[in-house]
Every structure is written in structure tokens, then in C-alpha cells.
């Protein structure tokens, strides 16, 4: 979490006569007992007892997992990927049995030279990581083959993927229908057949951070949220300060809740604080509200 | 290993002849292409002749009728024979090859080089 909220405890005191410290906190949530051995523990929520302590489930915390977390760590991928399937045809590479085997001198040399190809028509690409040949067949050569993109996470990963499968697209169309054979000769590194070119599938790396934050929060899924912090998704409460949908308890806790946060507003030795926001204060000795 | 020996170079009168020949070692000589590439003195190298494991031959504009391009696959050896030489024909000459049957000209396509063989025209 980033921010940690005190919890005052309450001692029991276990048939044992072992002195269990538990938070005393009133929350409304389920109530689940985990009894592990002859120790009873307060675990809620689907906690259990490891012998020293609850392990709570997120989004639970506290000493018998009865307080909910102000944040959830949710962990997008650091980089996300496509992948296009595409099929050229090379016609200035005759078919040979030899290129069937992944592990022949010439497939090697063919993967060798196909690469170094498109690494010179996709260069540019800031998105482009490399080519992998999936099979080679007849035709002169047709060459279906993976295209990898890759970009760092960011909330528009999706918006710059796409525009890199543009680009590819429009790069392999335009070297396939320049570099073409005269007179049966080729002066390219590699000619193609213009009409052999095909994207035949695209897929792009699904990451969707609400997906995963409503998830990790189970029960409280409505509650909580995404907000990016420097291209950074945070999963939190409202309770969680610092975001914009953060709420402010003026004088009290915020406290999450089945019903959403809420807050608990505190009683001073000059003030009693209410209101939604703990922010109406009457004085104790004079009967008078000031806001 | 696929190693290349050109030799075969010379200096010669214009008109005069050349033949070229290159000993392929560790190369499957039934296979692929090979091919005779020259450069002269701060121009690209340029494909000359090519032959494919077929017999399939190509030749540079320049140079056909004139020069001849075979290979002996049982002696792993490739020739090329130059006839009416010009001055234009000075250069270092290579030989190159790949495992593979090309049809391109282009010297960044063959992976197997020899050394070069200096070919001197004078008129």
C-alpha cells in the first residue's frame, strides 16, 4: 500500500492463555474464521493462520485480515509486444528440398539473408525487434514468417502498436513491389512477387489494467481505481491520498467499507467532527457550528 | 567450411585473354550458385557471371559474348574466361558463392568470398 493506516488493538485472550493482539476496528465486511490446530485465529476475509499470523488475501490487511488495503499493487508488463504473421513470396531464391529443413546450411543461409532484408526495410521502426521464419515452401520461395514489434508500457501501448503494424504493412508493401526481377535477374539483396504479399494475422499483447485492478479487488471492485502516476497505473481506493479521486476525511479516517469509503470522524478534547467529509466541527464547551 | 582460391590474374594486352579460376573447398559443389565479381579502383564491386548448380548462367551486359562463365563440379572448380579483354576490365576480380540457387546479382546476397585476383588491361 502507499500509505499505511494505524490500527489500535484490543487484547484477548485464547483458551490457551496466549494473549492474541487483534485491531479494533469496526468494519463490515464478511466474516470468515480460519481455526488451524488447536490455535484460534480471527482470520477474515480468507485469511489463515501461518502459526505467528494471519495471511491475509488481498485486498484484506491488518492482524485478522479485517481491514481493506488503500491501494493494490498491480504490476503491468514492463514491455508489450504484436505480432504480425505475414507471407512474402522471394522469386530471386529458387525452391530447393534443402530449405525444408530448419537445420540445413541453407535454410540457415536463406534465414541469414532474409533477415538482414528486413532488417533494412523495417529499420525505422522504432517498434521492430526482428523476423522469425515459420516455414518455407514452394512457389519460388514463399516465406511465412512472424514480424515482432515490441514498445514499452505505456497507457497507449495499444495506439503504438498499432501504428507500427501500419508502418510494417506499408514498408513491406512498398519493398516488394519496388524490388522485383528484370530479365530474370535481380539486382536487390532480395526480389519478391508483388501479388504474394499478405498480412495474415495480428496479435498484439492484451493488458488491461482496470481488468486486473477490479479483479485483485474482488468485492470491492466498484470501489476502486486506475490512476497513472508518470505513465504508472496505481489500482486504489479512494482512501488512498495523493490522487485526484482521492477522498478527504478533513478531521477523520477514511475507511473502505461494502458500501464505499466512508469516513470516521474524530472527537477531540475541544471538537466533535461530522458530516460525510468530518468536516463540520462543533466545540464542545460553546454549542456552536463553525465550517 | 566453405573456403574460395582465386587465381588466374594477369596483366594483358587489350584484346588479349584471361582465364580465371577458383577451387571451392567445404562447398557442396552440386548446390547453389557461383559467381565471379570484379571491382576496379574506387567503383562498387560488380557481378560479372554466375553459374547455378542447374548450369543456369547470367552474365553483366558488359561483358557477354565476351567472357564465359563453367563449373566442374566434380573437381570443385569454377572458370571464367575472358576473352577480348578492354581496359574497362581492370579490376580486382572475386569469386563468391552461396548455398542457395540465386538469381540476384547483388554481392551482399553471397555469403562465400575469395580472395581477389588482380586483372590488368592496358592498351
Known amino acids: 500500500p502507499l500509505a499505511t493506516i494505524p490500527v489500535s488493538t484490543t487484547s484477548l485472550t485464547s483458551s490457551e492463555g496466549s494473549t492474541i493482539s487483534t485491531p479494533s476496528v469496526d468494519i463490515s465486511t464478511p466474516v470468515t474464521t480460519s481455526i488451524v490446530g488447536d490455535q484460534c485465529s480471527r482470520c477474515k476475509n480468507g485469511g489463515f493462520w501461518d502459526g505467528l499470523k494471519c495471511q491475509c488475501l488481498t485486498p484484506y490487511y491488518g492482524e485478522s485480515c479485517e481491514e481493506v488495503v488503500n491501494s493494490i499493487d498491480i504490476a503491468p508488463p514492463e514491455t508489450v509486444s504484436a505480432q504480425m504473421e505475414l507471407t512474402v513470396t522471394v522469386t530471386s531464391v529458387k525452391f530447393t528440398d534443402e530449405l525444408k529443413n530448419h537445420s540445413s546450411q541453407e535454410f540457415r543461409e536463406f534465414n541469414k539473408t532474409f533477415t538482414e532484408q528486413m532488417n533494412i526495410v523495417y529499420s525505422g521502426i522504432p517498434e521492430y525487434v526482428g523476423v522469425n521464419i515459420t516455414n518455407l515452401r514452394l512457389g519460388s520461395v514463399v516465406v511465412e514468417h512472424d514480424v515482432l514489434l515490441r514498445t514499452k508500457y505505456t497507457p497507449e501501448y495499444k495506439t503504438a502498436l498499432d501504428n507500427a503494424t501500419e508502418v510494417v504493412k506499408q514498408k513491406i508493401t512498398k519493398v516488394t513491389t519496388e524490388q522485383i526481377m528484370t530479365n530474370d535477374n535481380c539486382s536487390a539483396l532480395m526480389c519478391f512477387n508483388t501479388t504474394g504479399t499478405q498480412v495474415q494475422n495480428i496479435t498484439v499483447t492484451q493488458y488491461d489494467p482496470v481488468e486486473e485492478c477490479r479483479q485483485k479487488a474482488e468485492e470491492y471492485e466498484d470501489y476502486f481505481l486506475v490512476e497513472y502516476r508518470d505513465q504508472k497505473p496505481y489500482c486504489i481506493s479512494p482512501c488512498e491520498s495523493g490522487f485526484n479521486a482521492s477522498k478527504n476525511c478533513n478531521h477523520g479516517k477514511c475507511q473502505m467499507s461494502q458500501n464505499g469509503a466512508r469516513c470516521l470522524c474524530v472527537t477531540t478534547e475541544t471538537h466533535w467532527y461530522s458530516g460525510e467529509d468530518c468536516n463540520q466541527g462543533t466545540q464542545k464547551s460553546h454549542h456552536h457550528h463553525h465550517h | 567450411d566453405v573456403q574460395l582460391q582465386a587465381s588466374g590474374g594477369g596483366s594483358v594486352q587489350s584484346g588479349g585473354s584471361l582465364r580465371l579460376s577458383c577451387a571451392a573447398s567445404?562447398?557442396?559443389?552440386?548446390?547453389?550458385?557461383m559467381a565471379w565479381f570484379r571491382q576496379a579502383p574506387g567503383r562498387e564491386r560488380e557481378g560479372v557471371a554466375f553459374i547455378n548448380s542447374d548450369g543456369r548462367t547470367s552474365y553483366a551486359e558488359s561483358v557477354k559474348g565476351r567472357f564465359t562463365i563453367s563449373r566442374d563440379n566434380a573437381l570443385s572448380t569454377l572458370w571464367l574466361q575472358m576473352n577480348s579483354l578492354k581496359p574497362e576490365d581492370t579490376g580486382m576480380y572475386y569469386c563468391?558463392?552461396?548455398?542457395?540457387?540465386?538469381?540476384?546479382?547483388?554481392?551482399?546476397?553471397?555469403?562465400?568470398w575469395g580472395q581477389g585476383t588482380q586483372v590488368t588491361v592496358s592498351s
Open positions: 563468391a558463392a552461396s548455398l542457395l540457387y540465386l538469381m540476384t546479382v547483388n554481392a551482399a546476397a553471397y555469403p562465400y
Open positions: 567445404g562447398f557442396p559443389s552440386s548446390r547453389g550458385t
